[in-house]
């Protein structure tokens, strides 16, 4: 059978014994930041090509022996993932390497960033076909590797890094916490979070989606045509490298939004098991385990959303948190979460022409989270609108009032400390989809966009008795884009979107108690792109032979075990 | 890159402009800040990058660097011009002592100086 | 142990260029910045330039600024110097050096063999 | 340029004899001074580096002393394999300049 990794990353309907992920990733070249690599291996050979770049520190120690294999070891073993004849992802793409960490696997930043420069240069002098860059190492949080990822990002580069080894926020970590950089955490056969001695793979926010890393069989520096199984972040960040030079070989014009959005949506959901992670990393952790696209087409036409969490707050009375999207996505709605309930809501406002989501802490609180649905809108226009809390007790509302704009996300935010002392506002009369409701002494604001046929609607579940948590999920073919509570009583913890279903947090029922206060709507706004669809429709019907599809039925390759497994 | 400077009569004129109180002050009201790895013994103290202002040229990072080096000299430390960044950062890395930090962030167009670190494979 | 090993002696006439190969073993060939220098017959010492190998940054001594050229192949650890529009004067033993930085101070620590170019119609 | 000179270019000693070489700066150049000695038809080797800081392996009778624009590097005791010709170099600013020589040869 395939090695475990390659079938996890292989679509359902390919899963058979007798297949393998298809022989594509021909039009990208993958660079690769990492060890100095032994070339001439069964694997890679004629694949990668080594280029002059060396930046590396002194090894450690004065006993320390150079030896070819040690030194390669890493590389080698990398470079076989993403692209190996056998056991890579992307078997049609091309590499080059950079050696940038020596015979200890350790490097420096400066190098790593004149390793990137390099790479900048080397495509302003010989522009090629997409690029994508693998960086699979760590360093602690360095605001100058990260500000180097994002002009690489900006200049059309898409950039891989492991979210690293520590068992830690991936945030405390370069280029890992980088925005702009896809950041991968590393899941094992059985989809759980993978133990690296006492340490393991990173997680939080700064992670974007995780992908096999334990027990990955690949190319050896021991000899030319030796296998070893490795463990790490860095092989679950080779994985994703591979699947993005397939899907960019597939679709060359992907921009690094576009393709980020799809490594998320097609990706396996909720698989795996978050108690694995510290309590309050979990529902800032994506439960996502990457995977290839079953085909590139009928992907066109899906709105592509994403949540994007902020960094926490702190805890002093104003402090305030800021969720932004990429440039080139769309902030659709804005929701808050605190631990401790005690929050002041969310609100969207422009910060350099671009909007923003910034979550309110309030007086005791703990800290707040902004959580931010990103989302692909070409040709969008959004605003919002903003009602002042109310005089009357029926509670603030808002709509969408320009013509053709429709109501993507609710926000509401109040300067009183405890919402929960007042009385509750009525819930929305049906038939007014619209337009946002809220607390009367809340601010509300609504996200109105105009986009080629883009439809909304909003759906909500309410539960009558207290519960820690009410959701609603939007159907087949619909993308969630807003997410809110109703009403926004200080019991409520928050909202927040995981993959299409947006989550209401309660405060623990026991401390609540159950009173007519209790009951908590989950309010989701969903939407979907009729432009997108008839776009893609038209694509397909003028195209043959292009996708993802076609390559996997012609590579029906069988899976040899006649290589030597060294372990 | 190769060296595009040259001109090695800059550093003594730099030395004498600043005897006479001539030499060019940072923008106003910017404050350059300096960053370091949280992480201890990841820090590698004595190399530094010196990030300047993003439309920042070649040429005036050059001469920035130029400039620090004349300084410096007149306190009596050496610093050596490791790498000037283009195409992605301007900016330079630097080999000097810590002691000179407080004059490095003063000197123009420096938008931020961070300490070099290790990173490791994954 | 560390050593600066040199190519061998050439002999150019006038006009031509001349290019040496200076190969590093014994050290991270990337971590340290390679320094040309040159000694002409019966002469001091004249420094000609330097390279920082691992990102290829020069530093050059303005007299040979519009002739010399520095390079390097990180995969064979060697640096190389070329000078063009070679004149009878140029005719010297060609030196690379190893530069060592230790905080505050930096000197050459180890140097090439030397490589004699001679000069001559 | 920075012109290193270095006096006397020439002197003759015999073994066990104190020598001292001088080098002047013609501008400040702080304590960024080495001292190499070359042996005819060798490369130089490093002595002094920083002005006064003795490199690992060179005999304690070799000494550098001096700062800003006056350097002088001391044989206290000359021993049979230090004839030699000795430069000093300074390395505060480009570019990087060396002086004449100075030959020590057997009296």
């Known amino acids: 059978s395939i090695p475990w990794n390659l079938e996890r990353i292989t679509p359902p309907r390919y899963r058979a014994d007798e297949y393998q992920p298809p022989d594509g990733g021909s039009l990208v070249e993958v660079y690769l930041l990492d060890t100095s690599i032994q070339s001439d291996h069964r694997e890679i050979e004629g694949r990668v090509m080594v280029t002059d770049f060396e930046n590396v520190p002194e090894e450690d120690g004065t006993r320390f022996h150079r030896q070819a294999s040690k030194c390669d070891s890493h590389g080698t073993h990398l470079a076989g993932v993403v692209s190996g004849r056998d056991a890579g992802v992307a078997k049609g793409a091309s590499m080059r390497s950079l050696r940038v960490l020596n015979c200890q696997g350790k490097g420096t930043v400066s190098g790593t960033l004149i390793g990137l420069e390099f790479i900048r240069k080397s495509q302003l002098v010989q522009p090629v076909g997409p690029l994508v860059v693998l960086l699979p190492l760590a360093g602690g949080y360095s605001r100058v590797l990260n500000a180097a990822c994002q002009r690489l990002a900006r200049a059309g580069v898409v950039l891989v890094t492991a979210a690293g080894n520590f068992r830690d926020d991936a945030c405390l970590y370069s280029p890992a916490s980088a925005p702009e950089v896809i950041t991968v955490g590393a899941t094992n056969a059985q989809d759980q979070p993978v133990t690296l001695g006492t340490l393991g793979t990173n997680f939080g926010r700064c992670v974007d989606l995780f992908a096999p890393g334990e027990d990955i069989i690949g190319a050896s520096s021991d000899c030319s045509t030796c296998f070893v199984s490795q463990s790490g972040t860095s092989q679950a960040a080779a994985h994703v490298a591979g699947i993005a030079a397939m899907m960019l070989s597939a679709e060359p014009e992907l921009t690094l939004a576009e393709l980020r959005q799809r490594l998320i949506h097609f990706s396996a959901k909720d698989v795996i098991n978050e108690a694995w992670f510290p309590e309050d990393q979990r529902v800032l952790t994506p439960n996502l385990v990457a995977a290839l696209p079953p085909s590139t087409h009928g992907a066109g036409w899906q709105l592509f959303c994403r949540t994007v969490w902020s960094a926490h707050s702190g805890p002093t009375r104003m402090a305030t948190a800021v969720a932004r999207c990429a440039p080139d996505e769309e902030l659709l709605s804005c929701s808050s979460f605190s631990r401790s309930g005690k929050r002041r809501g969310e609100r969207m406002e422009a910060q350099g022409g671009k909007l923003v989501c910034r979550a309110h802490n309030a007086f005791g609180g703990e800290g707040v989270y902004a959580i931010a649905r990103c989302c692909l809108l070409p040709q969008a226009n959004c605003s919002v609108h903003t009602a002042p809390p109310a005089e009357a007790s029926m509670g603030t509302r808002v709509h969408c009032h320009q013509q053709g704009h429709v109501l993507t996300g609710c926000s509401s935010h109040w300067e009183v400390e405890d919402l929960g002392t007042h009385k509750p506002p009525v819930l929305r009369p049906r038939g007014q989809p619209n337009q946002c409701v809220g607390h009367r002494e809340a601010s509300i604001h609504a996200s109105c966009c105009h986009a080629p046929g883009l439809e909304c609607k909003v759906k909500e579940h309410g539960i009558p008795a207290p519960q820690e948590q009410v959701t609603v999920a939007c159907e087949e073919g619909w993308t969630l884009t807003g997410c809110s509570a109703l009403p926004g009583t200080s019991h409520v913890l928050g909202a927040y979107a995981v993959d299409n279903t947006c989550v209401v947090r309660s405060r623990d029922v026991s401390t609540t108690g159950s009173t007519s206060e209790g009951a908590v709507t989950a309010v989701a706004i969903c939407c979907r792109s009729r432009h997108l669809a008839q776009a893609s429709q038209e694509l397909q019907g003028s195209t043959s032979g292009s996708g993802l599809n076609d390559i996997f039925e012609a590579q029906k390759i069988e899976w040899h075990e006649h290589h030597h497994h060294h372990h | 890159q190769e060296d595009e400077d040259g001109d090695y009569e800059e550093l003594v004129l730099a030395l004498r402009s600043e005897e006479d109180g001539l030499a060019e002050a940072p923008e106003h009201g910017t404050t350059a800040t300096f960053h370091r790895c949280a992480k201890d013994p990841w820090r590698l103290p004595g190399t530094y990058v010196v990030v300047l202002k993003e439309e920042t040229h070649l040429s005036q990072s050059e001469r920035t660097a130029r400039r620090l080096q004349a300084q410096a000299a007149r306190r009596g430390y050496l610093t050596k011009i490791l790498h000037v960044f283009h195409g992605l950062l301007p900016g330079f890395l630097v080999k000097m002592s810590g002691d000179l930090l407080e004059l490095a962030l003063k000197l123009p167009h420096v938008d931020y100086i961070e300490e070099d670190s290790s990173v490791f494979a994954q | 142990q560390v050593q600066l090993v040199q190519s061998g002696a050439e002999v150019k006439k006038p006009g031509a260029s001349v290019k040496v190969s200076c190969k590093a073993s014994g050290y991270t060939f990337t971590g340290y910045t390679i320094h040309w220098v040159r000694q002409a017959p019966g002469q001091g010492l004249e420094w000609m330039g330097e390279i920082n190998p691992s990102s290829t940054y020069t530093k050059f001594n303005q007299k040979f600024k519009d002739r010399v050229t520095m390079t390097r192949d990180t995969s064979i650890s060697t640096a190389y110097m070329e000078l063009s529009r070679l004149r009878s004067d140029d005719t010297a033993v060609y030196y690379c050096?190893?530069?060592?930085?230790?905080?505050?101070?930096?000197?050459?620590?180890?140097w090439g063999q030397g490589t004699t170019v001679t000069v001559s119609s | 340029d920075i012109v290193m000179t270095q006096s006397p270019s020439s002197l003759s000693a015999s073994v066990g004899d104190r020598v001292t070489i001088t080098c002047k700066a013609s501008q400040n150049v702080y304590t960024a001074v080495a001292w190499y000695q070359q042996k005819p038809g060798k490369s130089p080797k490093l002595l002094i580096y920083?002005?006064?800081n003795r490199y690992t392996g060179v005999p304690s009778r070799f000494s550098g002393s001096g700062s800003g624009t006056d350097f002088t590097l001391t044989i206290s005791s000359l021993q049979p394999e230090d004839f030699a010709t000795y430069f000093c170099q300074q390395y505060s600013s480009y570019p990087y300049t060396f002086g004449g020589g100075t030959k020590v040869e057997i009296k």
């Open positions: 920083s002005a006064s």
């Open positions: 050096a190893r530069e060592r930085i230790y905080s505050n101070y930096w000197f050459f620590d180890v």
